[in-house]
Interface confidence: low
Amino acid sequence: APRGTQAEESPFVGNPGNITGARGLTGTLRCQLQVQGEPPEVHWLRDGQILELADSTQTQVPLGEDEQDDWIVVSQLRITSLQLSDTGQYQCLVFLGHQTFVSQPGYVGLEGLPYFLEEPEDRTVAANTPFNLSCQAQGPPEPVDLLWLQDAVPLATAPGHGPQRSLHVPGLNKTSSFSCEAHNAKGVTTSRTATITVLPQQPRNLHLVSRQPTELEVAWTPGLSGIYPLTHCTLQAVLSDDGMGIQAGEPDPPEEPLTSQASVPPHQLRLGSLHPHTPYHIRVACTSSQGPSSWTHWLPVETPEGVPLGPPENISATRNGSQAFVHWQEPRAPLQGTLLGYRLAYQGQDTPEVLMDIGLRQEVTLELQGDGSVSNLTVCVAAYTAAGDGPWSLPVPLEAWRPGQAQPVHQLVKEPSTPAFSWPWW
């Protein structure tokens, strides 16, 4: 640090005083010097280092009429809102010719009520879930002892005896307030009061109960919610994108979820109006009077392929001797999936039912066994997808073929004398 030489007498006739106060105090340090000739610039030092950005003002008063006469120079350093960083030893410094002069030191000190560097913050926590709160304070004077309070009740017998900077709370079952007191020799400061809101725990075990082509039934296990009963749970569903739907290198904006509310209990919900055979993602959160839980992770689910919703249409069955010609058209009702084929069942009055898988053809010729005396033969047809058979048509009686009736060429299907499948007639 610069030091004054003793070759000449110090020009300083007034040195900085001392300031001690609490944070936020405004004060002024002052030094005065008398010099001959042109007045020098006065610099301020703190702990030996020049203050480059000091809030200082310099006043110069001539004592004579000639420039070479003496001048009185006064420099004032203003300290606004005293902080810990302002404390230390202050001196004035001037350069006169080839010599450097420094004033006697003055001291700035900080002393008052404790000052909070960190205070507990409002937050939400799940019921019965551990968490930590923070509080930090300083003087001077030191030491500073902390006392935590929960709902205005001290958590220790005296300051400094309980948890200090960090308070570990093993869990809450009701919304509570927390604050901390900071104690030092000057007195007590109280922190802000933090409200810790107790929310329900995240639901668990979200799973599918049943699936249908256009609806899903899901269930879950609720988490603990403290003293606050759950009011409802909210389920969200979105179409899964499977990485598809990307164009120009950018994915589509996410679909806004379909949101449904479920009364509780039961912790179960049916979600309808969905696409058949389509992947979705679902999640659930539950709400009490204090607010909602966090969402579960997205659960991938998929609606199944459905069975056709109606039977084949326009079934006709005609007989010509030992052959029966049956044809039909695709169901008019939605197939709810990929049509894999048709099943046909026929039965005579006194014969067991015969069940056949026709594939995707819409016509078949049956070669009737025996002497052709099978009576009251009826035929039913159903369409099927991978999900199973759709509804069977009403039984259609076999009509005798009349000359002139159109008879398309069909592939013959010879049935074995013993039916491959036997099925109780409905």
Epitope: L239, M244, G245, P254, E255, L258, P276
Partner: antibody, heavy 121, light 108 residues
Framework: EVQLLDSGGGLVQPGGSLRLSCAAS????????MSWVRQAPGKGLEWVSA????????YYADSVKGRFTISRDNSKNTLYLQMNSLRAADTAVYYC??????????????WGQGALVTVSS | EIVLTQSPGTLSLSPGERATLSCRAS???????LAWYQQKPGQAPRLLIY???SRATGIPDRFSGSGSGTDFTLTISRLEPEDFAVYYC?????????FGQGTKLEIK
Amino acid sequence: EVQLLDSGGGLVQPGGSLRLSCAASGFTFSSYAMSWVRQAPGKGLEWVSAISIGGGNAYYADSVKGRFTISRDNSKNTLYLQMNSLRAADTAVYYCAKPGFIMVRGPLDYWGQGALVTVSS
Amino acid sequence: EIVLTQSPGTLSLSPGERATLSCRASQSVSNSYLAWYQQKPGQAPRLLIYGASSRATGIPDRFSGSGSGTDFTLTISRLEPEDFAVYYCQQYGSSPYTFGQGTKLEIK
């Protein structure tokens, strides 16, 4: 019975604005995304815009992006299309349409009767 | 955006004949989210097929859809007089949800 009633069409000068409305009935409006589709005279169908069930996500054709705004009021069962900076190329019949499923990505199974918008000086 | 190209532009057939309409996408259509619509003069479009192959409620079984990826087909097995109209395909798998330019099916 599902019904979509389009209104608000008319004649407007280039650079002008118009707001179309679509009043929905016969289904739970708030459970379905909704779309606008337009058809210029003698031309094909052009998808214009769609909005998700709660109104949080909107989707637009490039030709109207930045000029048209789709919105909905679920309490009034009404869909809107605010059209600003209109051009002659926007002249068309505008149809409000409902998808068959809950999401924006759905086939349009019910359509309004259409509202004619003519942009001309 | 996905561009849908329909062919032919115009198809001239007689009642009772089979009609085959094509729709080709410039890139793969997500989850086969492709629909077919019929439109008659002065009327709003009517949904025929969704999900590339599922018939909408109340649509006669002479209408069928097929295809996946980028190539889709609408088939009308036996044309009835009321089937002569304009047919549009639309993809709804990726925004913007584009339409084809249409195929006009007219009586020969």
